[in-house]
């Protein structure tokens, strides 16, 4: 319970707080657990204790290990443990899982990404922010105090965000980076009774006998990815797959997300070599989801050839 994992990168500053809390007036002693050796408090040392804080300025891979802190008061002693791991810097852009701080979620209303652990450091603005290793540029991104604000959050904003800042200790500067994942939660996700955009109800579609014809059934179901939403065609009330006419096939169109964020689906009905008997069929565009089913009916009519002899 009173053990805390801390991690950092070699040649960066790392500051660790004792997991046991006490009044500022209480003394805190730090030890390297494996050797029980006391950590010095003199700031000239690369690793030194400063009250509740243990400072690695800068950290080295060899510093990895368990550190013990003992909070001493006139009436009691409290012991805590800091499990410190220092990693070598990665040559590539990828930030491994073990260097990640907790994932945060944002939405259109709330898109703050706090820089992890920054409150332990003596830093001055500005804070630099990177997404998937690329420096963030553009007016949508605002570094504000210890957090990043993203305006008009979109699902594409999800990813790994790294904050970079400088810790100052007695005039010496040390770099610190920290990375966390940001996921976008669409608080406005909802589902609607299906709305068929095309075809219009009881539409008459003109086709030419012997030519190919396409009919598109397009419907919207709400915002965000939809649960159990579908569009399909029926011929005379029968599924295309059961109708048994190889000339008539349905093909899934593109899943669409329009600018207003609505989730829409397309299904294209392809009729090859249109025949007279196709004009007698009833074509139903069906859109269904959890709220129910909407049906628009289409009929085909023969396109009159242009009379050139009039």
């Amino acid at each position: 319970k009173f053990s805390k994992q801390s991690w950092g990168l070699e040649n960066e500053a790392l500051i660790v707080r004792c997991p046991r809390q006490g009044k500022p007036s209480y003394t805190v002693d730090w030890y390297y657990s494996q050797t029980n050796k006391s950590i010095p408090t003199q700031e000239r040392n690369r690793v030194f204790a400063s009250g509740q804080l243990l400072k690695f300025l800068p950290a080295a891979v060899a510093d990895s290990g368990i550190y013990t802190c003992i909070v001493r008061s006139p009436t009691f002693n409290r012991t805590g443990y800091a499990n410190v791991t220092i990693y070598k810097k990665q040559s590539d852009c990828n930030v491994p899982d073990y260097l990640m701080y907790s994932t945060v979620s944002g939405s259109e209303k709330n898109s703050k990404i706090y820089c992890p652990t920054i409150d332990l450091y003596n830093w001055t603005a500005p804070l630099e922010w990177f997404k998937n290793c690329q420096a963030l540029q553009g007016s949508r991104y605002r570094a504000h105090k210890s957090f990043l604000v993203i305006d008009n959050v979109m699902t594409e904003d999800a990813g790994d965000y790294t904050c970079k800042f400088i810790h100052n200790e007695n005039g010496a500067n040390y770099s610190v980076t920290a990375t966390r994942s940001f996921t976008v939660k669409d608080e406005q996700g909802f589902s609607l009774f299906p709305v068929i955009g095309a075809p219009a109800q009881n539409e008459i579609k003109e086709v030419e006998i012997g030519k190919n014809a396409n009919l598109t059934c397009s419907a919207c179901f709400g915002k965000g990815t939809q649960f159990l939403a579908a569009v399909l065609w029926q011929l005379n009330g029968t599924k295309i797959t059961d109708f048994g006419e190889p000339r008539i096939q349905q093909e899934e169109g593109q899943n669409q997300s329009f600018s207003n964020g609505l989730a829409c689906l397309d299904m294209v009905l392809r009729i090859a070599d249109v025949k007279e008997e196709d004009l007698l069929l009833q074509y139903d565009c069906l859109a269904l989801n959890l709220h129910g089913l909407r049906r628009h009916t289409v009929r085909l009519s023969r396109k009159n050839p242009i009379d050139h002899h009039s």
């Epitope: 909802f190 589902s191 009774f193 709400g222 990815t225 649960f227 159990l228 959890l290 709220h291 129910g292």
Partner: antibody, heavy 116, light 107 residues
Framework: QVQLVQSGAEVKKPGSSVKVSCKAS????????ISWVRQAPGQGLEWMGW????????NYAQKFQGRVTMTRDTSTSTVYMELSSLRSEDTAVYYC?????????WGQGTLVTVSS | DIQMTQSPSSLSASVGDRVTITCRAS??????LDWYQQKPGKAPKLLIS???NLGSGVPSRFSGSGSGTDFTLTISSLQPEDFATYYC?????????FGGGTKVEIK
């Protein structure tokens, strides 16, 4: 933040009925559907059906047709699942779950024990 | 009904291990597959929707992939809190169906 709160555990006799409630808060009630999923002791998850909070449209898994009834009360943002002709194999935890983009929010579950 | 076959039904792993769970559908389900995590005595929790979209607050060590009939849930570095049972769910066609579950236990 959407929350689904279910009614408490029930002990029922074989042949009787049980009615489990699921009260929703946060979000717009009519903007989603509520699914019911059950889990017998030590078993996996089993879909029972759903009800649209928007219009009351229901769809029941074939296994439960004729025995299950799902209803809604828009004034209290509550949905109900009633299962009749109970038998010992209906002993399970019954969950309600919001079904919009996935089963993204779940109730805490209601244990229904059927025993003579 | 579409059958969802999950494998393995159980596995033992250590903290830090990479874990892969697969789910196979008896017919194509496009991208309409979710993954759920359930801990003893608790309700399931949405982990991943639409094959690869991480649920709210789900750590990035979880990832999903696949299409059509074969899908995979991967935990890149297993953590103590990840020991649980995992279920896949298809919602391409009615009725939605769950996989049988995969119990991830401590080795």
């Amino acid at each position: 933040q959407v929350q689904l709160v279910q009614s408490g555990a029930e002990v029922k006799k074989p042949g009787s009925s049980v009615k489990v409630s699921c009260k929703a808060s946060g979000g717009t009630f009519s903007n989603y559907a509520i699914s019911w999923v059950r889990q017998a002791p030590g078993q996996g998850l089993e879909w029972m059906g759903w009800i649209s909070a928007y219009n009351g449209n229901t769809n029941y898994a074939q296994k439960f047709q004729g025995r299950v009834t799902m209803t809604r009360d828009t004034s209290t943002s509550t949905v109900y699942m009633e299962l009749s002709s109970l038998r010992s194999e209906d002993t399970a935890v019954y969950y309600c779950a919001r079904s919009t983009n996935a089963l993204d929010y779940w109730g805490q579950g209601t244990l229904v024990t059927v025993s003579s | 009904d579409i059958q969802m076959t999950q494998s393995p039904s159980s596995l033992s792993a250590s903290v830090g291990d990479r874990v892969t769970i697969t789910c196979r559908a008896s017919q194509g389900i496009r991208s309409n597959l979710d993954w759920y995590q359930q801990k003893p005595g608790k309700a399931p929790k949405l982990l991943i929707s639409i094959v690869s979209n991480l649920g709210s607050g789900v750590p990035s060590r979880f990832s999903g992939s696949g299409s059509g009939t074969d899908f995979t849930l991967t935990i890149s570095s297993l953590q103590p809190e990840d020991f649980a049972t995992y279920y896949c769910l298809q919602h391409n066609s009615n009725p939605p169906t769950f996989g049988g579950g995969t119990k991830v236990e401590i080795k």
